[in-house]
């Protein structure tokens, strides 16, 4: 083994949300590279529960473990948390082997890349390549909606995937409308979903060297009287220069035939808010859903005054709801201005 | 309903050991990092220390490493801190805490233990 | 290990007023930023996640913004129930850490 090979951990995407723990077999004096995540959303490392700093021998960095000549002292467990949510991406444990100055006749195919196929991949464990398009584990849907599940995953070699229903293989010749399986999508699709439908489905990841599992729960919501659905993050928080025109959006679900207002939230007498502790408001537009783009507010040629909060509230025989946004009216002049809105807040 | 009850806190002498429990309820306990967070009287607040789900990966601030241990019985959806070499400084309000929507945030607190 | 400023550390304003509280990180946290309430006696309650994010149940007078170093809390329009004493907290990576909190009352 040349002093220039190093052990590495590749492709450089983000593995497995329940990964598997593993160990790696390095040589003293060996340099190490390993992988977590992309590196600009790449996770932090840590040694034994404590951070690795950006600079230095044994150092993470932009979502790399990086060590530059293994040493008795470097061996141990390293774990790689995604940032901002403390999900473990790597778990793993370094642990010393022979010298590079050893001989290597029965070395751990595991413990490095052949260095006479430096392009060649290791044979991998399945990993989630996607895992924040997983995050959603808990599925509530209406009765008649269409349900998927998806488990992006990689490895070497490519594992198979296969789906259970409540721990029992799962092949959906019992569903009325059956299911489609779509193996190059990893992904699990159920149309028109009924209660009988509800329980934990199950991808099971596997190939030669491992297997990985994730849980999805599915509740089918009978179809009940309810007061309209607003879509979350609508109307969006928006920021405009003097002069430009404006479209806030609301998505209105309701089984029973809704009604709709756009207000505009204003000041009387220095105050936001009547004796009766409900906003003063001014409506800007209202109509029935099944009128014409009742669900967009237009706001052409904005001005300083067109600034503030805006609501659309929806209501039917059963109840109203609401949801808000900010309007932010820049000067045209302006230098700082970005066309990034901020998040959609809303109200409950 | 999804709530986290502590209880074990007390007056001790400088020196000597307490432990600290945290009752989960209403939510999957099993596949939540928990945390402790402690207030010292007419301070801020202060994070301690993180357990992930697995139960044996532990995380400290160096304020308490080496003297206080954070873990977890599954089984019985309880998290606990073991506080040893116990200094007046370490007088507080301690909470336990966990991200339910899994981003990282605490959105869900104990109502603390003195 | 990151620190968050906070700024200021008491303000004092009057019911309807536009009150901004800032918070900034020793290094770049990405979003990855909350902002808690706090009242006598009580656990802290989550008000904003990752930086700009309402928690469900929370006001829209509630807002935040920022990204990296430089974050911003934001009460639109102060109402008497919002006396508290508010704290930002990083989760970009542990330890994680909190501002030293902004206690905020009633002129």
């Known amino acids: 083994l040349e002093a220039s090979e190093e052990v590495e951990l590749e492709p450089c995407l983000a593995p497995s949300l329940e990964q598997q723990e593993q160990e790696l077999t390095v040589a003293l004096g060996q340099p190490v590279r390993l992988c977590c995540g992309r590196a600009e959303r790449g996770g932090h490392w840590y040694k034994e529960g404590s951070r690795l700093a950006p600079a230095g021998r044994v150092r993470g960095w932009r979502g790399r473990l990086e060590i530059a000549s293994f040493l008795p002292e470097d061996a141990g467990r390293y774990l790689c948390l995604a940032r901002g949510s403390m999900i473990v991406l790597q778990n793993l444990t370094l642990i010393t082997g022979d010298s590079l100055t050893s001989s290597n006749d029965d070395e751990d195919p595991k413990s490095h890349r052949d260095p006479s196929n430096r392009h060649s991949y290791p044979q991998q464990a399945p990993y989630w390549t996607h895992p924040q398009r997983m995050e959603k584990k808990l599925h509530a849907v209406p009765a008649g909606n269409t349900v998927k599940f998806r488990c992006p995953a990689a490895g070497n070699p490519t594992p198979t995937i296969r789906w259970l229903k409540d721990g029992q293989a799962f092949h959906g010749e019992n569903r009325i409308g059956g299911i489609r399986l779509r193996h190059q999508h990893w992904s699990l699709v159920m149309e028109s979903v009924v209660p009988s439908d509800r329980g934990t489905y199950t991808c099971l990841v596997e190939n030669a060297v491992g297997s990985i599992r994730y849980n999805y729960l599915l509740d089918v919501l009978e179809r009940s009287p309810h007061r309209p659905i607003l879509q979350a993050g609508l109307p969006a928080n928006t920021t405009a220069v003097v002069g430009s025109d404006v479209e806030l959006l609301c998505k209105v679900y309701s089984d029973a035939q809704p009604h709709i207002q756009w207000l505009k939230h204003i000041v009387i007498n220095g105050s936001s808010f009547g004796a009766d502790g409900f906003p003063y408001v001014q409506v800007l537009k209202t109509a029935d859903i099944n009128s014409s783009e009742v669900e967009v507010l237009y706001l052409r040629n904005v001005s300083a005054e067109d600034a503030g909060e805006y609501t659309c509230l929806a209501g039917n025989s059963i109840g109203l709801s609401y949801q808000s946004a900010w309007l932010t009216v820049l000067p045209e002049e302006d230098p700082t201005w970005t066309a990034a809105a901020p998040e959609a807040r809303y109200t409950d | 309903q999804v709530q986290l009850v502590e209880t074990g806190g007390g007056v001790v002498q400088p020196g000597t050991s307490l432990r600290l429990s945290c009752a989960g309820s209403g939510f999957t306990f099993s596949e939540s990092g928990m945390h402790w967070v402690r207030q010292a009287p007419g301070k801020g607040l202060e994070w301690m220390a993180l357990?992930?789900?697995?139960?044996?990966?532990?995380f400290y601030a160096d304020s308490v490493k080496g003297r206080f241990t954070i873990s977890r019985d599954n089984s019985k959806n309880t998290l606990y801190l073991q506080m040893n070499s116990l200094r007046a400084e370490d007088t507080a309000v301690y909470y336990c805490a966990s991200s339910l929507g899994g981003n990282g945030a605490f959105d869900i607190w104990g109502q603390g233990t003195m | 290990d990151i620190q968050l400023t906070q700024s200021p550390s008491s303000l004092s304003a009057s019911v309807g007023d536009r009150v901004t509280i800032t918070c900034q990180a020793s290094q770049d946290i990405s979003n990855y930023l909350n902002w808690y309430q706090q009242k006598p006696g009580k656990a802290p309650k989550l008000l904003i996640y990752?930086?700009?994010n309402l928690e469900i149940g929370v006001p829209s007078r509630f807002s935040g913004s920022g990204s990296g170093t430089d974050f911003t809390f934001t009460i639109s329009s102060l109402q008497p129930e919002d006396i508290a004493t508010y704290y930002c907290q990083q989760h970009d990576n542990l330890p994680l850490s909190f501002g030293g909190g902004t206690k905020l009352d009633i002129k």
């Open positions: 990752d930086a700009s």
């Open positions: 357990i992930l789900n697995d139960g044996i990966s532990n």
